[in-house]
Interface confidence: low
């Protein structure tokens, strides 16, 4: 047996063998050397590179009682769960004195059923909408041919004849399963089965049908939903008067929106209980038994102004000769918009009514015709917005002003009945 450290003498008495197997195999490579004196550390090389983190064990057995006698050194490299990255040429390496010795090589090869690098994934798609699926497999042995299956039915007549790494699906009208088979000389491996769930298409043309001060009616056009009828549509709305706003298409509004559900058909929903003259943002999604569509973009909408819901308050009207002094306060009831002004009407018992636009003032001096002998003069006041006049106050009689007496104030004890409408609760 070779001994010593002469350049021409290799200390190796056993070289690594060969391993060929399928992925996941566990195997061991072994090399043995006989040296004189202190045993060296055995290193392992793969394709000429030292394996720094090799799972190796080294056993040393002295052949004599003296340290300078010969030693048998055995190193074993364990390969657990064989992968493609483990394949290559393996050698043992030792440093003896000033010389380096390398064993004869052994080879690790991989050969078995195809191995999937990429498999089709579950996903949701809108009805009748194109999409792609991916599948990729490798040997060795090569070549590896793929065969796609839809609902367990092959899409090509033979492996390798149809689509390979990417399958283009022009659209589905029902939820379907897809898988791919990988074929090589060793046999067939089947990928996971991906479920492609068909959801309704995003609704289109979300728009306002009608606007009332406290109510908006919206409608939309549903998208295709395949063989699955729509069960309902969901409308989300958010108050957008906080200055932040929502840009069309932004993913999230400034506050979490809340939700109303609409039976379908009709693809229409009345949103009640809104604020007059207030901006909102709305979006809609429609749902089938398979799940919901994607949301439409946020649509900005705004309720129109309404008329004031009550008359001006605390109207007082006094008369001094040919002049009448009338003043009042803003209505306490909701204005439902921007107050533009007040209208005043006065009328005597036998004289026609006179109508005046006072603007935003809350008092007026009236110049009465004649000598002031008109009897039973009464005054009414109404507030108005861009939407029109609110209710008129009850008629207030003009009272004669006497020196030293405070102007009488007529409290309104009764208001005209409020029209029925949805109140803005939020």
């Amino acid at each position: 047996a070779p001994r010593g450290t002469q350049a021409e003498e290799s200390p190796f008495v056993g070289n690594p063998g060969n391993i060929t197997g399928a992925r996941g195999l566990t195997g061991t490579l072994r090399c043995q050397l006989q040296v004189q004196g202190e045993p060296p550390e055995v290193h392992w090389l793969r394709d000429g590179q030292i394996l720094e983190l090799a799972d190796s064990t080294q056993t040393q057995v002295p052949l004599g009682e003296d340290e300078q006698d010969d030693w048998i050194v055995v190193s074993q490299l364990r390969i657990t769960s064989l992968q493609l990255s483990d394949t290559g040429q393996y050698q043992c390496l030792v440093f003896l004195g000033h010389q380096t010795f390398v064993s004869q090589p052994g080879y690790v090869g991989l050969e078995g059923l195809p191995y999937f690098l990429e498999e089709p994934e579950d996903r949701t798609v809108a009805a009748n909408t194109p999409f792609n699926l991916s599948c990729q497999a490798q040997g060795p042995p090569e070549p590896v041919d793929l065969l796609w299956l839809q609902d367990a039915v092959p899409l090509a007549t033979a492996p390798g004849h149809g689509p390979q790494r990417s399958l283009h699906v022009p659209g589905l009208n029902k939820t379907s399963s897809f898988s791919c088979e990988a074929h090589n000389a060793k046999g067939v491996t089947t990928s996971r089965t991906a479920t492609i769930t068909v959801l309704p298409q995003q609704p289109r043309n979300l728009h306002l049908v009608s606007r009332q001060p406290t109510e908006l009616e919206v409608a939309w056009t549903p998208g295709l939903s395949g063989i699955y009828p729509l069960t309902h549509c969901t409308l989300q709305a958010v108050l957008s008067d906080d200055g932040m706003g929502i840009q069309a298409g932004e993913p999230d509004p400034p506050e979490e929106p809340l939700t109303s559900q609409a039976s379908v058909p009709p693809h229409q929903l009345r949103l009640g209980s809104l604020h007059p003259h207030t901006p909102y943002h709305i979006r809609v999604a429609c749902t089938s038994s398979q799940g919901p569509s994607s949301w439409t973009h946020w649509l900005p909408v705004e309720t129109p102004e309404g008329v004031p819901l009550g008359p001006p308050e605390n109207i007082s009207a006094t008369r001094n000769g040919s002049q009448a002094f009338v003043h009042w306060q803003e209505p306490r009831a909701p204005l439902q918009g921007t107050l533009l002004g007040y209208r005043l009407a006065y009328q005597g018992q036998d004289t026609p009514e006179v109508l005046m636009d006072i603007g935003l003032r809350q008092e007026v001096t009236l110049e009465l015709q004649g000598d002031g002998s008109v009897s039973n003069l009464t005054v009414c006041v109404a507030a108005y917005t861009a939407a029109g006049d609110g209710p008129w106050s009850l008629p207030v009689p003009l009272e004669a002003w006497r020196p030293g007496q405070a102007q009488p104030v007529h409290q309104l004890v009764k208001e005209p009945s409020t029209p029925a409408f949805s109140w803005p609760w939020w």
Partner: antibody
């Protein structure tokens, strides 16, 4: 953490006045309405008054209209219920509750204060 | 005013039972209805809003349905902590109104 804390309840003679406060933390009044709901001993819930997040509107149950006034100080994040001309039938635990925008529910309530 | 009429006013049930409480509005209130649970000495808790939407953190055994005038709260499998009084409430029109309550007691 969202919290509502009522205070100001107590014993009062018929015809007297009380002012209840509802201090809010964990959210801003700017997009949230506040409502007062009461519950007489052994009875159900009765809505009293509400103030929405925008506008100057205030709303009242017919039974308290003209006697109670709801208001809010956004700088203090506090709502108030001023109760005048109190009657024996106003005896109840008064709760304030938060009203989220565009929903039909009160999602956070205070612990209540007894009047 | 819109009246909300709840039925029954009380019921006895056992743990695991399916319980249904109904609420009828005197006029159409769309889906502007909420359901609350209240235990003695405590503030009400929101369970369902907008007729059918489960409020965050509420167990999925609670569900709501209905629109227009007829609404239902269902507890699919009654648990010991569910014995309480339940109220419906409409917010479609002023004044806001509650049902008279349904007390769920242990049989």
């Amino acid at each position: 953490e969202v919290q509502l804390v009522e205070s100001g309840g107590g014993l009062v003679q018929p015809g007297g006045s009380l002012r209840l406060s509802c201090a809010a933390s964990g959210f801003s009044f700017t997009s949230i309405g506040i409502h007062w709901v009461r519950q007489a001993p052994g009875k159900g819930l009765e809505w009293v008054a509400g103030i929405p997040p925008v506008g100057r509107y205030t709303y009242y149950a017919d039974s308290v209209k003209g006697r109670f006034t709801i208001s809010a100080d956004t700088s203090k994040n506090t709502a108030y219920l001023q109760m005048n001309s109190l009657r024996a039938e106003d005896t109840a635990v008064y709760y304030c509750a938060r009203w989220r925008s565009l929903s039909s529910g009160m999602d956070y309530w205070g612990q209540g204060t007894l009047v | 005013d819109i009246q909300m009429t709840q039925s029954p006013s009380s019921l006895s049930a056992s743990v695991g039972d399916r319980v249904t409480i109904t609420c009828r509005a005197s006029q159409d209130v769309s889906t502007a209805v909420a359901w609350y649970q209240q235990k003695p000495g405590k503030a009400p808790k929101l369970l369902i809003y907008s007729a059918s939407f489960l409020y965050s953190g509420v167990p999925s055994r609670f569900s709501g349905s209905g629109s227009g005038t007829d609404f239902t709260l269902t507890i699919s499998s009654l648990q010991p902590e569910d014995f309480a009084t339940y109220y419906c409430q409409q917010s479609y029109m002023s004044p806001l109104t509650f049902g008279q309550g349904t007390k769920v007691e242990i049989k």
